[in-house]
């Protein structure tokens, strides 16, 4: 594979020229010191700039704000500010896009010292606003209902929950003294209440509410509540054991009528749970550890979300800020990428190909040394910069990039050694999900998928104005350079159409003259240099997760193999915006590595085999299950959540109801009688830290 | 010329032994998965076993398991099929066949056959 | 073990018509789908391979369609030497099996 000076890379003929009649030049006369933008709508072309200037004077901000409409993917805005009656919108809340293709937006204005605020709302995709008074001052952005986008939620500075059914005309309060809310399944809300109490101060003794009809009704589901979550089809929340300061985790999958234990370790005060991913599958789980160490553990649940498997030790999650590099590789099944602090304090990072299954060191790409950090210069791994790094303000401009219909492609930056080096870093790229990798452009770069994967576009990162863009039509083997201007300019942001569907790239950024600074975007469509439509030569058949072709299990992960119709790098053509990616499945024969170990069980290192837990040999494996004790008949295997395997091995698995009666329900946890109590089902864990970046749920 | 030839095919009586070779040349043999595949007079083809390159995957048809020993002999270039208590129903056209290199390959280059005739 | 079920058994055709063969598995093998052809008394050869990729030095009269569970193969303007049997294999799977084959004779 070959980088930007690659000896058998040829530019492709007249790009410049091509790119030039399609380079869209837009000068904000607008001297504001931030811009976000917002993309309403899928494929619509509709993009909304919000620029805000503001200066705190005493207790109150003053400021200003422009909103900026474009219609053709950013090549022209129009000035709309008049639509928001110039009103100063707050910057902290950004612009709310609704749900699906609904049109609608939320922008909150800022009243500063009076007791109600205002929102301007749109339901054209932003061609119109209109304002509507609220009765109270919102914490945090409004939330949409994500099936019904004209009923909207809202928190209180003073902690009261807000309900409009009409799109924000009309509003009617729920419930006071209210900690947290997040919309469920179906219009289900829950939040944790306080109804004798401040938020603040009595964490662990909130009620988890529901209502199921907008309010009009309430149940309390849970008590002694710390924290709670929602991941895939399990509602999670972190509980007051009775023991004094420590916490544990119950999980429920009927939105809260009946709830177990999760066989996770309980944790003290200064330690969390969070849950790092989830689906309706299973859920990975970091469990932190006691102490300030900044790690902790990862652990994954079997499909109830009740006995957890011990995945990765020493996961990096800091406390602080709380910082963790967990990150779903999107663009395959079962990957995940994170970092673990290893005994000697450095940073190493750990994939996985199965879900939680087994964690590797990523493989060394070819052509690459080992840096300074590694003890044996020809033995090493690719390390991976992520949140973390970027929290360290290290030179690291973005966190790895994937996207679904971009197959097998990584993007991120790295460093090659033992460990994550504070060097500048170079960029690095995938092409099968992860398992090989190779040096794609030297020193930081801002990079971006186009087109399912068809274009890779990056700028480099400087502290220098900046005129040039890089691309690579054949997955980052290549690169050409255009110049979008004769005008360098300041460099903020690389911005397109989220869901890597676009030919559109715009490039953000100021130009500084005497004085003065201004906004500038320019945006390129890529369509003249993908000129045809792809057809179907232009797509090989590519098989997931392949590690050893001889093999007649090779690509099987989780019980099926996938073989997809993958772009060929030598093709350049559009995949096009309704591009949908072709994906055969095949089911595999069954293995022990398709089951994780059952309630009572564990797996040595370096064994497939479960074996019984120690100290419940003998013993009748007895747990507390919906109420009822149930006794286990087992071999020690529970088929891994989401497995399809077929066939081949078979461990028997049986369970029987005792029909006795037994409380799991955290409603009253010290009447807790099952005799699993505990960490008996392999040890697992949770997470209370709902709300970090990308995290499912962080206490 | 990318050429496979097998050999030692012939009449055997039920319960006897015999043993197969398929002679390789003209492409680097060590890289392939070979396999044997069989077919009756008068019938379709059937899959009898199959070897990785370097002898770590082995795999057999339930009829023959137990009976049937694929292996090879990449300094000979040279693939054996060792047919132990042959029956009547394992007379057949034996080819050797090469694998292509990819996952869940085809058979890309077929030899031409060494008939197995098991009677009494 | 996945069971391939060619059709039709036997097709006899005037030169320069189409023959389209068809081959379903009794559970999806995704793209690993190959087509043989065997005349009278020789060994297979390979035509088509992962359902629609044609061999080296194969007829560009001969293509090959499908995925999942149903697979076709298509001669496009049949010729007298194409009468032979054809075989449909798949290697998703153990034991790797083969149609019970179609015969395609010339009229």
């Known amino acids: 594979r070959s980088t930007e000076q690659g000896e058998s890379c040829s530019g492709l003929l007249g790009a410049d020229a091509k790119l030039a009649g399609n380079t869209h030049q837009h000068i904000f006369n607008d001297l504001s010191g931030s811009v976000s933008l917002a993309w309403v709508g899928d494929g619509t072309g509709v993009i909304l700039a919000l620029t805000t200037f503001q200066v705190p004077i005493f207790m109150i901000t003053i400021g200003q704000s422009k909103l900026y409409r474009s219609e053709d993917y950013g090549k022209s805005f129009e000035d709309v500010t008049n639509l928001i009656n110039n009103t100063f919108i707050r910057s902290d809340f950004g612009i709310a896009i609704g749900p699906e293709n609904s049109g609608k937006v939320i922008l909150t204005a800022d009243v500063s010292g009076s007791h109600g605020s205002r929102i301007f709302v749109s339901s054209d995709f932003g061609k119109s606003f209109t304002h509507q008074e609220l009765p109270f001052v919102p914490l945090m952005q409004i939330t949409y209902n994500p099936e019904n986008s004209n009923v909207l939620l809202a928190l209180s500075n003073k902690n009261e929950l807000w309900l409009s059914e009409d799109f924000g005309t009309n509003w009617k309060k729920l419930y006071d003294t209210v900690c947290l809310a997040k919309w469920g399944r179906k219009g289900t809300i829950f939040f944790t209440a306080n109804h004798n109490g401040s938020c603040s101060n009595d964490r662990g003794m909130l009620e988890l509410e529901r209502t199921t009809d907008y309010g009009k009704s309430f149940k309390t589901v849970a008590s002694k509540i710390y924290s709670f979550g929602l991941g895939g089809k399990f509602l999670f929340a972190s509980v007051m054991t009775g023991k004094g300061t420590l916490r544990a985790i119950h999980v429920s999958v009927d939105d809260g009528d009946t709830w177990n234990m999760a066989q996770l370790p309980s944790v003290g005060q200064e330690q969390f749970y969070s849950i790092l991913a989830a689906n309706d599958d299973m859920v990975f789980m970091h469990v932190d550890e006691p102490g300030d160490t900044g790690f902790g553990t990862i652990f994954t649940s079997d499909d109830r979300g009740i006995v957890y498997s011990k995945s990765l030790d020493r996961h990096l999650y800091t406390t602080t800020g709380g910082e963790t590099d967990f990150t779903n590789v999107t663009s395959l099944r079962g990957v995940y990428i994170t970092s673990v602090l290893s005994e000697d304090n450095s940073i190493q990072t750990m994939i996985t190909f199965d879900q939680g299954g087994r964690w590797t060191h990523l493989r060394k790409p070819e052509n690459s040394e080992c840096d300074a950090t590694a003890k044996n210069k020809n033995e090493c791994s690719l390390h991976i910069h992520a949140s973390y790094s970027i929290s360290q303000k290290l030179n690291v401009p973005m966190a790895p990039l994937s996207e679904p219909n971009a197959v097998g492609i990584v993007i991120a930056h790295g460093s090659v050694g033992d460990a994550i080096s504070v060097m500048v870093p170079d960029v690095y790229i995938s092409d099968d999900g992860g398992y090989s990798w190779t040096k794609m452009l030297e020193g930081p770069h801002y990079y971006t998928i186009l087109d399912s994967g068809g274009i890779i576009v990056a700028i480099e990162h400087s502290s220098r104005p900046i005129n040039v863009i890089k691309f690579s039509t054949d997955e980052g083997q290549c690169w050409q350079t255009y110049t979008f201007t004769r005008d360098p300019i300041y460099f903020t942001g690389l911005a397109s159409e989220p869901g890597a569907r676009s030919m559109n790239i715009s490039i953000w950024g100021f130009t500084e003259s005497f004085l003065t600074s201004q906004w500038v975007s320019y945006t390129i469509d890529f369509k003249d240099i993908l000129e045809r439509n792809c057809e179907e030569k232009d797509y090989t058949i590519w098989l997931a997760h392949s590690t050893d072709p001889e093999d007649y299990e090779d690509g099987c992960i989780l019980g099926y193999k996938e073989q997809f119709l993958r772009l060929r790098k030598s093709s350049v053509c559009q995949n096009g915006r309704d591009y949908v990616v072709t994906k055969q499945p095949s089911i595999c024969l069954c293995s022990l590595e398709d089951f994780l170990c059952d309630f009572g069980y564990y797996r040595p290192e370096n064994d497939s085999k479960c074996v019984e837990q120690p100290e419940l040999k003998g013993h009748d494996l007895e747990f507390c299950l919906y109420g009822r004790e149930e006794h286990l008949t087992t071999n020690g295997y529970r088929k891994i959540p989401g497995d399809k395997c077929q066939g081949g091995v078979n461990p028997v698995r049986e369970v029987k109801d005792l029909k006795k009666k037994c409380t799991s329900n955290f409603l009253s946890p010290e009447k807790q009688n099952s005799k699993s109590n505990g960490s008996a089902g392999g040890s697992g864990g949770l997470n209370d830290i709902f709300e970090a970046q990308k995290i499912e749920w962080h206490e | 010329e990318v050429q496979l030839v097998e050999s030692g095919g012939g009449l055997v009586k039920p319960g006897g032994s015999l043993r197969l070779s398929c002679a390789a040349s003209?492409?680097?043999?060590?890289?392939?998965?070979m396999n044997w595949v069989r077919q009756a007079p008068g019938k379709g083809l059937e899959w009898v076993s199959s070897i990785s390159s370097s002898s770590s995957y082995i795999y057999y048809a339930d009829s023959v398991k137990g009976r049937f020993t694929i292996s090879r002999d990449n300094a000979k270039n040279s693939l054996y099929l060792q047919m132990n208590s042959l029956r009547a129903e394992d007379t057949a056209v034996y080819y050797c066949?090469?694998?292509?290199?990819?996952?869940?390959?085809?058979?890309?280059?077929w030899g031409q056959g060494t008939m197995v005739t098991v009677s009494s | 073990e996945i069971v391939l079920t060619q059709s039709p058994d036997f097709q006899s055709v005037t030169p320069k018509e189409k023959v389209t063969i068809t081959c379903r598995a009794s559970q999806s093998i995704g793209y690993s789908l190959h087509w043989y052809q065997q005349k009278p008394d020789q060994s297979p050869k390979l035509l088509i391979k992962y359902a629609s990729q044609s061999f080296s030095g194969v007829p560009s009269r001969f293509s090959g369609s499908g995925s999942g569970t149903d697979f076709t193969l298509t001669i496009n303007s049949l010729e007298a030497e194409d009468a032979a049997a054809y075989y449909c294999?798949?290697?998703?799977?153990?034991?790797?099996?083969f149609g019970g084959g179609t015969k395609v004779e010339i009229k």
């Open positions: 003209g492409f680097t043999f060590s890289s392939y998965s």
């Open positions: 066949a090469r694998r292509g290199s990819g996952s869940y390959d085809a058979f890309d280059i």
């Open positions: 294999h798949q290697s998703s799977s153990l034991p790797l099996t």
